[in-house]
Interface confidence: low
């Protein structure tokens, strides 16, 4: 798949930021702010938590989530999974693209200890027009939102 | 803001590296090496710890800092904040762009235990000509410098 | 070194993924999948674990490795080093480019506790045609492979 950068052509890019509405608790992907503050879309679209590709090519996609808690709540998995996933017309299920597993909870030796951790993912993937990329965090109860600078999601064509 | 890549145009990029002089202890941003070793500036400028934008556009900005210590020194905050901040003529205060909070100290259960951690940040932001981006770490006493490969700061136009 | 993006020119990029054969135990660099699944090479070559540059320029290079274990095995270093290194005709030894040190083991307070951690590195470096970049992890026994989404290595020209 030869992908070319033609002169005078806008390079697709986006940076979406975490907001109070990001965590749905529904088991779905995280939702994102697309316009306010640092958030923008340029040559990419957005729908229900997903960056939607309008132009096929190779994209560097990335996401960071801020994790935090007080001790380890009972029933909370010791492993946090943060991942970027693709939804495509060619497959019925989401496809894992980039994934991290962390055990940040284990840092807090006492049950009342406050802890923070951050997970960053980034990598180049090929995306077709119409394909979607979403971010998931399991368990999302540990994601700490504030002002859009600590948890975010973005992409740009390379 | 439509940003175009014209043919035969050099794409702004920079990679600055940690040096002995990076940690000032003055409460200011980290300072960086701009020329020696792996460090370079291409289409961007540098001033007092800041990458200075000479051409408006969307930039992927990034920073990594190497953290480390022996146990948790008394008086040391349990939370380390590592962030990229923007200085702009339009606002008197720095603006948070990308931020991480970590509690690496909590890993060391005994007071004499050596620990290491690393914090990476990266994301796309829009920057105007003349705007500056800096890196801050609180508490900077935990930043471990060596040869410019473990703590660094960079950007490139996307 | 002025590097230009000419119109209609393919931009070098690659994303290599972790596979069962990645960990050699030989003290050499990690090996990678170059074709299956998410892995690809475009304007870059691959040889014995290394991305080989075919066109000189500035490249954003990156790697993520998934770490994990059960407690801290005896004889296992408390520090994990994950780095990107350059091999060049001009020097007999590998050159450190981007490096992280982490102490993930310290999170597990009991010897039977399962822990996970992830290390991400990314930065812009100048590479000449024929130069190579490899990934090393010490101690590689803690790298956890699965399906190519958790440990990977890539680059693209900026």
């Amino acid at each position: 798949l030869i992908q070319e950068r033609r002169s005078h052509e806008v390079n697709p890019a986006a940076h979406l930021t975490g907001a109070n509405s990001s965590l749905t608790g529904s088991g779905g992907p995280l939702l994102w702010e697309t316009q306010l503050g640092l958030a923008f879309l340029r040559g990419l679209s957005y729908h229900d938590g997903a960056l939607v590709v309008t132009k096929a090519g190779y994209y560097y996609i990335y996401s960071k989530v801020q994790l935090g808690g007080v001790g380890c709540p009972l029933g909370l998995a010791s492993t946090i999974t943060h991942g970027l996933y693709k939804r495509t017309p060619r497959y019925p299920e989401e496809l894992e693209l980039l994934v991290s597993q962390q055990s940040p909870c284990g840092r807090a030796t006492s049950s009342s200890r406050v802890w923070w951790d951050s997970s960053f993912l980034g990598g180049v993937v090929h995306l077709e027009a119409g394909e979607k990329v979403v971010v998931r965090v399991l368990d999302e109860r540990l994601v700490r939102l504030r002002d859009g600078t600590r948890s975010y999601f973005g992409a740009f064509m390379v | 803001l439509i940003q175009e890549r014209r043919s035969h145009e050099v794409n702004p990029a920079a990679h600055l590296t940690g040096a002995n002089s990076s940690l000032t202890g003055s409460g200011g941003p980290l300072l960086w090496e701009t020329q020696l070793g792996l460090a370079f500036l291409r289409g961007l400028s540098y001033h007092d710890g800041a990458l200075v934008v000479t051409k408006a556009g969307y930039y992927y900005i990034y920073s990594k800092v190497q953290l480390g210590g022996v146990g948790c020194p008394l008086g040391l905050a349990s939370t380390i904040t590592h962030g990229l901040y923007k200085r702009t003529p339009r606002y008197p205060e720095e603006l948070e762009l990308l931020v991480s909070q970590q509690s690496p100290c909590g890993r060391a259960t005994s007071s004499s235990r050596v620990w290491w951690d690393s914090s990476f940040l990266g994301g796309v932001v829009h920057l105007e000509a003349g705007e500056k981006v800096v890196v801050r770490v609180l508490d900077e006493r935990l930043v471990r410098l060596r040869d410019g490969t473990r703590s660094y700061f960079g950007a490139f136009m996307v | 070194l002025i590097q230009e993006r000419r119109s209609h020119e393919v931009n070098p990029a690659a994303h290599l993924t972790g596979a069962n054969s990645s960990l050699t135990g030989s003290g050499g660099p990690l090996l990678w999948e170059t074709q299956l699944g998410l892995a690809f090479l475009r304007g870059l070559s691959y040889h014995d674990g290394a991305l080989v540059v075919t066109k000189a320029g500035y490249y954003y290079i990156y790697s993520k490795v998934q770490l994990g274990g059960v407690g801290c095995p005896l004889g296992l270093a408390s520090t994990i080093t994950h780095g990107l290194y350059k091999r060049t005709p001009r020097y007999p030894e590998e050159l450190e480019l981007l490096v992280s040190q982490q102490s993930p083991c310290g999170r597990a307070t009991s010897s039977s506790r399962v822990w996970w951690d992830s290390s991400f590195l990314g930065g812009v470096v100048h590479l000449e045609a024929g130069e190579k970049v490899v990934v090393r992890v010490l101690d590689e026994r803690l790298v956890r492979l699965r399906d190519g989404t958790r440990s990977y290595f890539g680059a693209f020209m900026v």
């Epitope: - | - | 074709q35 090479l41 070559s45 691959y46 040889h47 005709p89 007999p92 024929g130 130069e131 190579k132």
Partner: antibody, heavy 122, light 107 residues
Amino acid sequence: QVQLVQSGAEVKKPGASVKVSCKASGYTFTSYYIHWVRQAPGQRLEWMGWIFPGSDITKYNEKFKGRVTITRDTSASTAYMELSSLRSEDTAVYYCAREDYGISTYSAMDFWGQGTLVTVSS
Amino acid sequence: DIQLTQSPSFLSASVGDRVTITCKASQDVGTAVAWYQQKPGKAPKLLIYWASTRHTGVPSRFSGSGSGTEFTLTISSLQPEDFATYYCQQYSSYPLTFGQGTKVEIK
């Protein structure tokens, strides 16, 4: 200018060994790989292995492993290829060639020796 | 091992003709491909490396293209001294391998 000069033709009996030399001049011998490639009559070129003269590192084609040994003498700027347990199908022209990049890189072979014909016949 | 298959194996052409030789790899080799010219009784000469980069001193009528598994050597205007056998070679993975060759003859 870069030159690779090989030793003369050899006739050997099956089971014997042959050692072909390749003397380099016009460049820094220790900074470039030397490859050995052979070509049987009417056949395609076949890579046998290389040596990096600066550190004596070698890499061999598995097909020849155990039968081929590549060595060098830095003081004489000369590389050697020895092939043992010769058989009739080893009859070929053997070439040494320099790789055009230095250590830890991979590329094409930009300068070749003139070739050495090795005939294996009883 | 990576197999390289050249086509055609033989080619008859006249001076001034445009000649195209293809090389197909059995697996992705990126752009780690070289082309050589060999005349009878002589050693091969490097023409193209990294799929499309002309070696020093090689005339501009020789050009290479391709990536992945399909590569092409083109001689834009055949000259009398170009009648020879041409080989492609991959150096993406060991063992290094060559194509079977394409012999360009005078028509």
